[in-house]
């Protein structure tokens, strides 16, 4: 490789979050090169001495890959030529959190950018009417969260009202002993109103809405990652 190291290319990363047990993406783009064989992508993680991933001469080169990432990483090989160096991380672990460096070498020069990767668990809540309860009650359930989130109820009619006195939230550890199931119950619900169950930790914020009328029930859920420009 005849790169003097004195020319720099632009490399851009985006902070992101990974959901434990699922696949995640560490985003990185760079000024593309015309020849795939001239592009080298190296992913490094702070505190890890081996490489997270290496791609060169059009294929993965994993001889120096650190054990903690073995069999869990891949780049989008067909997109490298257009400047996509993003890394797919399979089966995200809690310990994958940290600072990563996307390091690129091309015939034009070299460049790098760091990104913060957070890991946790987050899931969409579902709000239902609890017909088993003695009074009109709503039940908000989300199967996987970590770290432990806060749960806040809100209502369209009673905007700004504090529902903490008329709600009860519990956290149940899931079988893998990391993530938890979130269950929150709201009592004394009035009809013809829209209620929102908002679950939030430092990684994600999720909202489950339910509109209860005499004739129908409408539900809507939304999940947003925090501190991520994705």
């Amino acid at each position: 490789f005849g790169i003097s190291g004195r020319h720099s290319i632009t490399v851009t990363t985006v902070a992101s979050a990974g959901n434990i047990g699922e696949d995640g993406i560490l985003s990185c783009t760079f000024e593309p090169d015309i020849k795939l064989s001239d592009i080298v992508i190296q992913w490094l993680k702070e505190g890890v001495l081996g490489l997270v991933h290496e791609f060169k001469e059009g294929k993965d080169e994993l001889s120096e890959q650190d054990e903690m990432f073995r069999g869990r990483t891949a780049v989008f090989a067909d997109q490298v030529i257009v400047g996509n160096a993003s890394l797919r991380l399979k089966n995200v672990q809690l310990t994958d959190a940290g600072t990563y460096k996307c390091y690129i070498i091309t015939s034009k020069g070299k460049g790098n950018a760091n990104l913060e990767y957070k890991t946790g668990a987050f899931s969409m809540p579902e709000v239902n009417v609890d017909y088993n309860a003695s009074s009109e009650t709503l039940r908000c359930e989300a199967p996987r969260w970590f770290p432990q989130p806060t749960v806040v109820w809100a209502s369209q009619v009673d905007q700004g009202a504090n529902f903490s006195e008329v709600s009860n939230t519990s956290f149940e550890l899931n079988s893998e002993n990391v993530t938890m199931k979130v269950v929150s119950v709201l009592y004394n619900v009035t009809i013809n109103n829209t209620y929102s169950c908002m679950i939030e930790n430092d990684i994600a914020k999720a909202t489950g809405d339910i509109k209860v009328t005499e004739s129908e029930i409408k539900r809507r859920s939304h999940l947003q990652l925090l501190n991520s420009k994705a």
Epitope: K45, G47, L49, K101
Partner: antibody
Amino acid sequence: EVQLLESGGGLVQPGGSLRLSCAASGFTFNTHAMHWVRQAPGKGLEWVSAISGSGGSTYYADSVKGRFTISRDISKNTLYLQMNSLRAEDTAVYYCARLLGRFGEYGMDVWGQGTTVTVSS
Amino acid sequence: DIQMTQSPSSLSASVGDRVTITCRASQTVYTWLAWYQQKPGKAPKLLIYDATNLATGVPSRFSGSGSGTDFTLTISSLQPEDFATYYCQQSYSTSWTFGGGTKVEIK
């Protein structure tokens, strides 16, 4: 002042054991990977072992694998090298060194003064 | 393991001379290369890291170049305190191999 101070060297018989210590000061110990490097009398530098900042990953030269164990005690800011089944060819000055850079791609920027290990009957 | 070969193994030079030491890796190490200076009875001292970057407090007469497999350490004008042994070392592979060293002696 950033400093590394080795201790624990000495004379030991072949087959014997020794534990080297390296006391670190002046920097955040648990954010830096650390190394042991040795130098036999009149010879060049030979990398021996490395440990990540958290202590979760360890690496060894083939010549010491299975006999030496690197570890670190973050509460004591100390790096260790447990050396078992020592051989005459392990005779050397042993240095501990700090790895420069957050990602392990740079050189060793801080070195201790060295401690001498002599394996002889 | 990646082998690092330094040349020459020793050289004689005078104060004020321009000195060049080369280091060749058995496979690419990109720019993951460092240079050290060691004086008798002392610990090594980092001179250059990432092939071309001068370590803190190192005089500007020292410079590094190269990438891939071929690297050079240059001392532009040799000073009396520069007579020592110089080592290259790769950190691409987690075997952190050193070159055999180059001893710079007074002519």
